[in-house]
Amino acid sequence: LEIGRFDPERGRGAAPCQAVEIPMCRGIGYNLTRMPNLLGHTSQGEAAAELAEFAPLVQYGCHSHLRFFLCSLYAPMCTDQVSTPIPACRPMCEQARLRCAPIMEQFNFGWPDSLDCARLPTRNDPHALCMEAPENA
């Protein structure tokens, strides 16, 4: 199952949407998420703790949509119309990796396996919903 792929069967008993409580994911264009997220975190607290480690990289500004991209994985958008979490599309991930991986490498960190762009939908379509880069970010 591709990350973000729409699966009607999985919708039965899907967890309800919940307000985003992760500080880094405030003001990114949506305010509802669903757990577990796309990285397997079962609570927002667990997701927030790990996501926060990216704060210096986001502040560095290597990619304008990095925060939005990370939040799309750690606190994916939730809507009652779709049963699965909706991540960012693959191109945004590729751009973020292209620009930010070299910065991480300067500090002896590799691009995390958990952020493997190949797992994301290539483009937004009814069978693999994903989010394009926000225009105002």
């Epitope: 992760i22 500080p23 405030r26 003001g27 609570s43 607290g45 926060a52």
Partner: antibody, heavy 120, light 107 residues
């Protein structure tokens, strides 16, 4: 130097509203969140909510949802916190505090506090 | 919401003593914890952020440690100006929550 200066003490009747101001100086106003924290007499600190002066985005503690409103005037680098339907339990010192990086690293600059007394 | 507890609620100590205050979160907050000092009639002052990072201008006798749910603030050698109330605060998720405070007074 970086500082937050708050408005003066207020005395209000139950059911009324109060609007406290917090004027920022010494840094880029829109770059850092402003949080509001209150402290009832002899009690501990209670986080009320956070406000992003850049886009006006707010997050409120559930307890205050529907009663608190945070706004800003970017021309004067001032953030406002309005609390409505006041009751005696709202008697407290209200602080504004600056927080960078989504609040992850704590609140590094605080206003001097505004005493709000609710009494009939 | 994440609940924060502190112990002890108060303690008496002498100048020069080593003082340790503990803070516990109801669920894991990784290292996202701050410590504040507050004196009567004054606003709180940030001492430690991200569990163990010393805020600029804060004396090195203050130190913080811990991760997950258990955290400690240590004052290696208590000074007269350190008699105050100390609060921990989790900054991992909204709503940010404070511990009830620990009052440090003169023995």
């Amino acid at each position: 130097q970086v500082q937050l200066v708050q408005s003066g003490a207020e005395v209000k009747k139950p059911g009324a509203s109060v609007k406290v101001s917090c004027k920022a100086s010494g840094y880029t106003f829109t770059s850092y969140d402003i949080n509001w924290v209150r402290q009832a007499p002899g009690q501990g600190l209670e986080w009320m909510g956070g406000f992003d002066p850049e886009d006006g985005e707010t997050i409120y503690a559930q307890k205050f949802q529907g009663r608190v409103t945070m706004t800003r005037d970017t021309s004067t680098s001032t953030v406002y916190m309005e609390l409505s339907s006041l009751r005696s339990e709202d008697t407290a010192v209200y602080y504004c505090a600056k927080a960078g990086d989504w609040g992850l690293y704590g609140m590094d600059v605080w206003g001097q506090g505004t005493m709000v007394t609710v009494s009939s | 919401d994440i609940q924060m507890t502190q112990s002890p609620s108060s303690l008496s100590a002498s100048v020069g003593d080593r003082v340790t205050i503990t803070c516990r979160a109801s669920q894991s907050i990784s290292r996202w914890l701050a410590w504040y000092q507050q004196k009567p009639g004054k606003a709180p002052k940030l001492l430690i952020y991200a569990a163990s990072s010393l805020q600029s201008g804060v004396p090195s006798r203050f130190s913080g440690s811990g991760s997950g749910t258990d955290f400690t603030l240590t004052i290696s050698s208590l000074q007269p100006e350190d008699f105050a109330t100390y609060y921990c605060q989790q900054t991992n998720t909204f709503p940010f929550t404070f511990g009830p405070g620990t009052k440090v007074d003169i023995k």
